[in-house]
């Protein structure tokens, strides 16, 4: 999947753009908003009717090296009595993010952007019947 | 910089950290093997904490379009379709990495940016705030 070039419908390419080899892009790894913090409600993963656990995946050749994945704890949802209600489904909510991967080929190093799907949490949904055509 | 290990057999010509500026292949590798958008496309409607999706577009960013979730109700939807205000619909937020064109308008020059997105909503039991 190639990154779309800036279309002329938006604006002209400025003269000040740095020269970049064909098929590549220049990427500054100094992150904008590096210290931004998630301000989610406290402990929602355990208070949710579709609770989840977190698993940390670690890869030193990836940035960010730490990616946190959620897994729904139950197949059903937790009712007011604290029991699992299987007439409802706990389902994962997912979000795509970019990661930067460093690849070693002998002593040379190349960099590749990857799209990774992160499971962020779970939500409780009403199932539907599969209507056969 | 971003700390990355080096192949120990290679000459010590690079910093232990990621270089501040790197050249990256324009092709983005897609690792999403076990997802199927048709399955999750209607969770926003079927959830007990349903949400609306708002389009956030910025041509200076890749991806240029990001969808933001906003919970429809303060409470959660019961089986009878009514809202139960003894429970709370809350957004699930996630930090994601995007590319920001830098300098502005340049087609192939970017900087990494962290942004916070609301991905969906979940129904939670409220916490009682005990005053000390």
């Amino acid at each position: 999947r190639k990154i779309p070039k800036v279309g002329h419908t938006f604006f002209q390419k400025p003269e000040s753009c740095p020269p970049v080899p064909e098929g590549s892009m220049k990427l500054d790894t100094g992150i904008i908003n590096e210290n931004q913090r998630v301000s989610m409600s406290r402990n929602i993963e355990s208070r949710s009717t579709s609770p989840w656990n977190y698993t940390v995946t670690w890869d030193p050749n990836r940035y960010p090296s730490e990616v946190v994945q959620a897994q729904c704890k139950h197949l059903g949802c937790i009712n007011a009595q604290g029991k699992e209600d299987i007439s409802m489904n706990s389902v994962p909510i997912q979000q795509e993010t970019l990661v930067l991967r460093r690849k070693h080929q002998g002593c040379s190093v190349s960099f590749q952007l990857e799209k990774v799907l992160v499971t962020v949490g779970c939500t409780c949904v009403t199932p539907v019947v599969h209507h056969v055509q | 910089g971003i700390a990355i290990p080096r192949n120990s057999g290679c000459p010590n010509s690079e910093d232990k950290n990621f270089p501040r500026t790197v050249m990256v292949n324009l092709n983005i590798h897609n690792r999403n093997t076990s997802t199927n958008p048709k399955r999750s496309s209607d969770y926003y409607n079927r959830s007990t904490s349903p949400w609306n999706l708002h389009r956030n577009e910025d041509p200076e960013r890749y991806p240029s379009v990001i969808w933001e979730a906003k919970c429809r109700h303060l409470g959660c939807v019961k089986a009878d379709g009514n809202v139960d205000y003894h429970m709370n619909s809350v957004p699930i937020q996630q930090e994601i990495l995007v590319l920001r064109r830098e300098p502005r308008h340049c087609p192939n020059s970017f900087r990494l940016e962290k942004i916070l997105v609301s991905v969906g909503c979940t129904c939670v039991t409220p916490i009682v705030h005990h005053v000390a």
């Epitope: 197949l75 007439s87 489904n89 539907v128 | 199927n36």
Partner: antibody
């Protein structure tokens, strides 16, 4: 033709293992959650295990938890049940059943069944 | 665990008669109850789901009713092919898919 065909049953000694397979045809396999349901000779039905479309959701009956493992291979349109530490009370006809939930999710009703494969655990 | 009790264990009727089968749950399963038919040497077949919804291809003589703890499967006029064992099943609470012990409908 829409069908499920089980295989892999047979006579096995207590404590040993067996792997059941279910071949699905005539429908888009990964559009459905799948289950194993068993029936002891002359007895009623007992749900054993279920798995959603991408193996992200799996459940087991207490009677088999820790001994049986359900899995699926969507590329091969196949469902499996690995049965370890088999006991005499596992003797039954094992049915493969298709969940009627949409989007490969669980609905916990079974709209399509195979003919079953017989597992006999005896010394 | 929810226990489903079916009654009677055996129902002896003639073709053309009305059959009424009962399923009682040990606690409420709301409307999440299904009915299956099983003929000798065959796999079960789904008849009714969510207490009263007929599955695809099921004749109109089969109907289901009830909610909470008491449910009924009615066969308005028995056909020769309806003589079989009938099971109820809940999908309300864990463990899922618990079945009743069955009711055998036999020819009188």
């Amino acid at each position: 033709e829409v069908q499920l065909v089980e295989s892999g049953g047979g006579l096995v000694q207590p404590g040993r293992s067996l792997r059941l397979s279910c071949a699905a045809s005539g429908f888009t396999f990964d559009d459905y959650a799948m289950h194993w349901v068993r029936q002891a000779p002359g007895k009623g039905l007992e749900w054993v295990s279920g798995i959603n479309w991408n193996s992200g959701g799996i459940g087991y009956a207490d009677s088999v938890k820790g001994r049986f493992t359900i899995s699926r291979d969507n590329a091969k349109n196949s469902l499996y049940l690995q049965m370890n530490s088999l006991r005499a009370e596992d003797t039954a006809l094992y049915y493969c059943a298709r969940d009627m939930g949409g989007f490969g999710e669980f609905y916990w009703n079974f709209g399509l069944w195979g003919r079953g494969t017989l597992v006999t655990v005896s010394s | 665990e929810i226990v489903l009790t079916q009654s009677p264990a055996t129902l002896s009727l003639s073709p053309g008669e009305r059959a009424t089968l009962s399923c009682r749950a040990s606690q409420s399963v709301r409307s999440y109850l299904a009915w299956y038919q099983q003929k000798p040497g065959q796999a079960p077949r789904l008849l009714i789901y969510d207490a009263s919804n007929r599955a695809t291809g099921i004749p109109a003589r089969f109907s289901g009713s009830g909610s909470g703890t008491d449910f009924t499967l009615t066969i308005s006029s028995l056909e020769p092919e309806d003589f079989a064992v009938y099971y109820c099943q809940q999908r309300s609470n864990w463990p899922p898919a618990t079945f009743g012990g069955g009711t055998k409908v036999e020819i009188k």
